[in-house]
């Protein structure tokens, strides 16, 4: 988790002098509770926006927006703590809006925004806005939270972001798999424009089960420049196991930008349809 660039972050608006500060996520009002605290944020909204860094890279960011309730507690509002928690790693990043002037009621509802938290593809975050000072131990909570799921690199708008492109999102291998005679599979896919090796991972399963009955790995050496964007054809030999008929073919590239952590593409071959005709009953019954 990080903030997009470290250029001057602004939270001031007409009628309010405000500064954005790094936060330890442990506001002083936890340790030294105040008697009078503001009410919670209203109408917390989170959207996925895209922002360029000063170097020209494009990153997905969480655009956080909320409004204030129209009650007298804004007289005691000293700022806000914005917290983003990445759920699978428990990593948390916070910033603090510090109000340098007192808020007054005006003809429009106060609205605040922040769009500098960089988020990762296919990750879920808990986004919390806490009004400051935080409430006394038994006081009503004065925060609002939402869990926000960021689309993965298959999403059209995410595909062109720097983190997705770095993991190979622009490569479309257009995999085709066909079953040949004599227990073989023909795998065909389009090579990317980089001299890097690939790996084909074959996993086979019984018709209706999810534990594998055969696994095989096939290495494809790095193509020469004249082979870029050409189709690569590979024939894989299967184990002659009756019922081991559903095959998942996964292609793992090793691009220089993502090494062994690149996006993988896969295709599946289903088991052949079983004919509905019943088993023929033998004309005679052997006695031994």
């Amino acid at each position: 988790l990080r903030l997009l660039d470290h250029r001057a972050l602004v939270c001031s608006q007409p009628g309010l002098n405000c500064t954005v500060k790094n936060s330890t996520c442990l506001d002083d009002s936890w340790i030294h509770p105040r008697n009078l605290t503001p009410s919670s944020p209203k109408d917390l909204q989170i959207q996925l926006h895209f922002a360029h860094t000063q170097q020209g890279d494009l990153f997905p960011v969480a655009h956080i927006e909320w409004t204030l309730q129209t009650d007298a507690s804004i007289l005691y509002l000293e700022g806000a703590e914005l917290s983003v928690l990445q759920l699978n790693t428990n990593e948390r990043l916070c910033v603090r809006f510090e109000f340098l002037s007192k808020l007054r009621h005006h003809h429009r509802r106060w609205r605040f925004t922040f769009s500098h938290f960089v988020v990762d593809p296919d990750q879920e975050y808990e986004v919390t806005v806490h009004h400051l000072p935080k409430p006394i131990p038994d006081g009503d909570p004065n925060h609002q939270s939402k869990n926000f799921l960021v689309p993965d690199c298959e999403h059209a708008r995410m595909k062109v972001t720097t983190p997705c492109m770095s993991s190979g999102s622009l490569w479309d291998p257009n995999i085709t798999v066909e079953t040949l005679e004599a227990h073989q599979l023909r795998v065909s896919f389009t090579l990317w424009n980089e001299s890097t090796h690939y790996q084909i991972l074959l996993t086979s399963f019984p018709h209706m089960e999810n534990h594998s009955c055969f696994e095989h790995m096939h290495h494809i050496p790095a193509p020469r420049p004249e082979e870029f964007h050409q189709r690569s054809n590979v024939t894989l030999t299967l184990r002659n196991l009756k019922g081991c008929c559903r095959h998942q073919v996964q292609i793992q590239p090793f691009f220089s930008s993502c090494l062994n952590d690149c996006l993988r593409h896969s295709a599946t071959v289903s088991c052949p349809e079983m004919p509905d005709t019943p088993e023929p009953i033998p004309d005679y019954m052997p006695l031994w």
Epitope: Q45, I46, Q47, L48, H63, E65, K146, N147, F148, L149, V150, P151, D152, E154, H155, A156, R157
Partner: nanobody
Framework: EVQLVESGGGLVQPGRSLRLSCAAS????????MHWVRQAPGKGLEWVSG????????DYADSVKGRFTISRDNAKNSLYLQMNSLRAEDTALYYC???????????????????WGQGTLVTVSS
Amino acid sequence: EVQLVESGGGLVQPGRSLRLSCAASGFPFDDYAMHWVRQAPGKGLEWVSGISWNSGRIDYADSVKGRFTISRDNAKNSLYLQMNSLRAEDTALYYCAKDMGLGYCSGGSCSHFDHWGQGTLVTVSS
């Protein structure tokens, strides 16, 4: 112009099933999370279910969990709601709604629903 058109509502007996459809046009359907929201007679709006852009994440209101199934077909720009074991309290006008922003928030919209259909009426009565 964004359009959401619901269909499939009607009069049904308690315990029976119904399938609602929502045909979307005028925006890249497979970029956005979609939701079903309902309004019972004389009541406020109630969020029913949501589905992320690629069906990877799905959520339901407690009142319909285990009975309703949301799904989408991005190739057909369509959203569906399969309603089983219907009860009298499911009687409502059902709306299909588009999330305003990209991304997905569990338990409702991340921001606002910026486009709604005209609704399809579901009446559960014996």
